[in-house]
C-alpha cells in the first residue's frame, strides 16, 4: 500500500534538483575567481539540510543559516540592482553592465533561480510531486523562506545609490506584496543608503506617460522617504534602446531620452 503523501497546490521540486544545484555551483565558481574557495559539495549539503526531513510549511530563516554562511559573498555595495516583476530585463542589463549585480548574479541567487524544492516531514525524500504554494498553502515554505532570507541579506548589504527596475506594464508598478516591496525596501539601511533610484520600464512603444507619477510609485516614495532615504525615479520609455545604449553608450542616438 503506498504511503499517504501530502498533496500541495504548487508544482513539485524541479527535476534533477540536486544535480542542478551542484552543477550550477561548480559553474559559478568556475566563472568567478573570488568564489573558488567554495566547496560545492558542502554547499549542497547545507542547502539540502535546510529543508530535507522538515515539514515544508514550517521552514525558518534559521534553517538556511549554514547555507548563508557558506555562500557569503562580497559584492560592491554601490552596484546593486533590485527588480520587481521584470527579472529578464534586469538580468539582461547586468549581463551587459558587468559591474552591477542582481541577487541572481550572486552564488546563492544563481543556484536557486527559477527552481522549486521541498521535502517531507520525517523522511529524507525530496518531493517531486508537489510543493506548498505561498498563497494557497503556506508562506513558510522552503522556496519562499529562501528568497526572503537572501533578499533581506542582499538589501542589507546595499549602500550609496541603489537602483530598482520596476515593470511599468503592471497595474501595480510598485507592489507592497512583492519581495521587493515586502522585504528589500524595509531592509535597506538608511545609514548606508543615500538614494533609491527607480527605473520604471515602459511596455508599449507609444507609451509616453510619466509613470513616475503613478500612485504606487508615490507610495514607494513615501515609504522610502519615511526611512530617511532619498528617492528618485526615471522613466525608461524604450527598454530595447536602453539596453542597446548600455552596450554602446557612444552611439549618437543615445543622447536623447531613452
Amino acid at each position: 500500500v503506498p504511503r499517504w503523501r501530502q498533496q500541495w497546490s504548487g508544482p513539485g521540486t524541479t527535476k534533477r534538483f540536486p544535480e542542478t544545484v551542484l552543477a550550477r555551483c561548480v559553474k559559478y565558481t568556475e566563472i568567478h575567481p573570488e568564489m573558488r574557495h567554495v566547496d560545492c559539495q558542502s554547499v549542497w549539503d547545507a542547502f539540502k539540510g535546510a529543508f530535507i526531513s522538515k515539514h515544508p510549511c514550517n521552514i525558518t530563516e534559521e534553517d538556511y543559516q549554514p547555507l548563508m554562511k557558506l555562500g557569503t559573498q562580497t559584492v560592491p555595495c554601490n552596484k546593486i540592482l533590485l527588480w520587481s516583476r521584470i527579472k529578464d530585463l534586469a538580468h539582461q542589463f547586468t549581463q551587459v553592465q558587468r559591474d552591477m549585480f542582481t541577487l541572481e548574479d550572486t552564488l546563492l541567487g544563481y543556484l536557486a533561480d527559477d527552481l522549486t524544492w521541498c521535502g517531507e516531514f520525517n523522511t529524507s525524500k525530496i518531493n517531486y510531486q508537489s510543493c506548498p504554494d505561498w498563497r494557497k498553502d503556506c508562506s513558510n515554505n522552503p522556496v519562499s523562506v529562501f528568497w526572503k532570507t537572501v533578499s533581506r541579506r542582499f538589501a542589507e548589504a546595499a549602500c550609496d545609490v541603489v537602483h530598482v527596475m520596476l515593470n511599468g506594464s503592471r497595474s501595480k508598478i510598485f507592489d507592497k506584496n512583492s519581495t521587493f516591496g515586502s522585504v528589500e525596501v524595509h531592509n535597506l539601511q538608511p545609514e548606508k543608503v543615500q538614494t533609491l533610484e527607480a527605473w520604471v520600464i515602459h511596455g508599449g512603444r507609444e507609451d509616453s506617460r510619466d509613470l513616475c507619477q503613478d500612485p504606487t510609485i508615490k507610495e514607494l516614495e513615501s515609504i522610502i522617504s519615511k526611512r530617511n532615504i532619498q528617492f528618485s525615479c526615471k522613466n525608461i520609455y524604450r527598454p530595447d534602446k536602453f539596453l542597446q545604449c548600455v552596450k554602446n553608450p557612444e552611439d549618437s542616438s543615445c543622447t536623447s531620452e531613452i
Epitope: E19, A23, V26, T29, R36, H37
Partner: antibody, heavy 116, light 107 residues
C-alpha cells in the same frame, strides 16, 4: 570513492585524430567538471580544457581551440577528449581529472604516441 | 597567459630535513593556487589548494603559504615517500597554467 579509468595507449600517424575516454565510477558524474591535462615526455603539465557534463558546454585552452573536442555522456558516466591534426609534439600522456580548476582525482593517464 | 615560475629546478634534501619550494606568478592570482606531487609513472596528486588548504588525506607536514604572486610549499620533515616532482598551478585566470616543476631528490 571516485575513480577515473582511462582508455589504453594509442599509436597514431601525423595528421590523424585520437579519442581518449575517461570513465567515472563511485560518485555522481554529472555535476563535477572533468578536465584534461597532458604531459609530454619529461615535461610539465598542460591544461587543455574541461566540461561540466550536466551543462555540456566545454571550455578549451586557446592553444588547443579548433583541434580539441571534449564531450561527456551522462548515461555512461564517461568523458571524451578528441585531438585532431596530430603532430609529433602531441606525443604525451593525457590525463583526465575531476574538477574544473583544481584537480583532486586523476585518471591513470593514456599515452598517445604520434609517429610516422 | 599567466606564467608560473618554480624554483629551484632541483632541491637536494636529506630525509628528516625541511624543504621549501617556491612558485612565482607573472601577475596576481590571489589565493587561487594549487600544489601537486607527482612520482615517476604516476598521475599527479593534489596536495594543497587555495594556496594554504591541505587536500583530503594529505599529511600535516605539507603546508602552503602566500598570495598574489609569491607562494611557498613547505615539507617540514621529509619522508622517503616525499621524494618526487612538485608542481604549482594557478586557477585564477584562464587558461589554468602550471609551473615547470621542482624535483625534490635525496641528498
Amino acid at each position: 570513492q571516485v575513480q577515473l579509468v582511462q582508455s589504453g595507449a594509442e599509436v597514431k600517424k601525423p595528421g590523424s585524430s585520437v579519442k581518449v575516454s575517461c570513465k567515472a565510477s563511485g560518485g555522481l558524474f554529472s555535476f563535477y567538471a572533468i578536465s584534461w591535462v597532458r604531459q609530454a615526455p619529461g615535461q610539465g603539465l598542460e591544461w587543455m580544457g574541461g566540461i561540466i557534463p550536466f551543462f555540456g558546454e566545454p571550455q578549451y585552452a586557446q592553444k588547443f581551440q579548433g583541434r580539441v573536442t571534449i564531450t561527456a555522456d551522462e548515461s555512461t558516466s564517461t568523458a571524451y577528449m578528441e585531438l585532431s591534426s596530430l603532430r609529433s609534439e602531441d606525443t604525451a600522456v593525457y590525463y583526465c581529472a575531476r574538477g574544473s580548476y583544481r584537480f583532486d582525482v586523476w585518471g591513470q593517464g593514456t599515452l598517445v604516441t604520434v609517429s610516422a | 597567459e599567466i606564467v608560473m615560475t618554480q624554483s629551484p629546478a632541483t632541491l637536494s634534501v636529506s630525509p628528516g630535513e625541511r624543504a621549501t619550494l617556491s612558485c612565482r606568478a607573472s601577475q596576481s592570482v590571489s589565493s587561487n593556487l594549487a600544489w601537486y606531487q607527482q612520482k615517476p609513472g604516476q598521475a599527479p596528486r593534489l596536495l594543497i589548494y587555495g594556496a594554504s588548504t591541505r587536500a583530503t588525506g594529505i599529511p600535516a607536514r605539507f603546508s602552503g603559504s602566500g598570495s598574489g604572486t609569491e607562494f611557498t610549499l613547505t615539507i617540514s620533515s621529509l619522508q622517503s615517500e616525499d621524494f618526487a616532482v612538485y608542481y604549482c598551478q594557478q586557477y585564477n585566470n584562464w587558461p589554468w597554467t602550471f609551473g615547470q616543476g621542482t624535483k625534490v631528490e635525496i641528498k
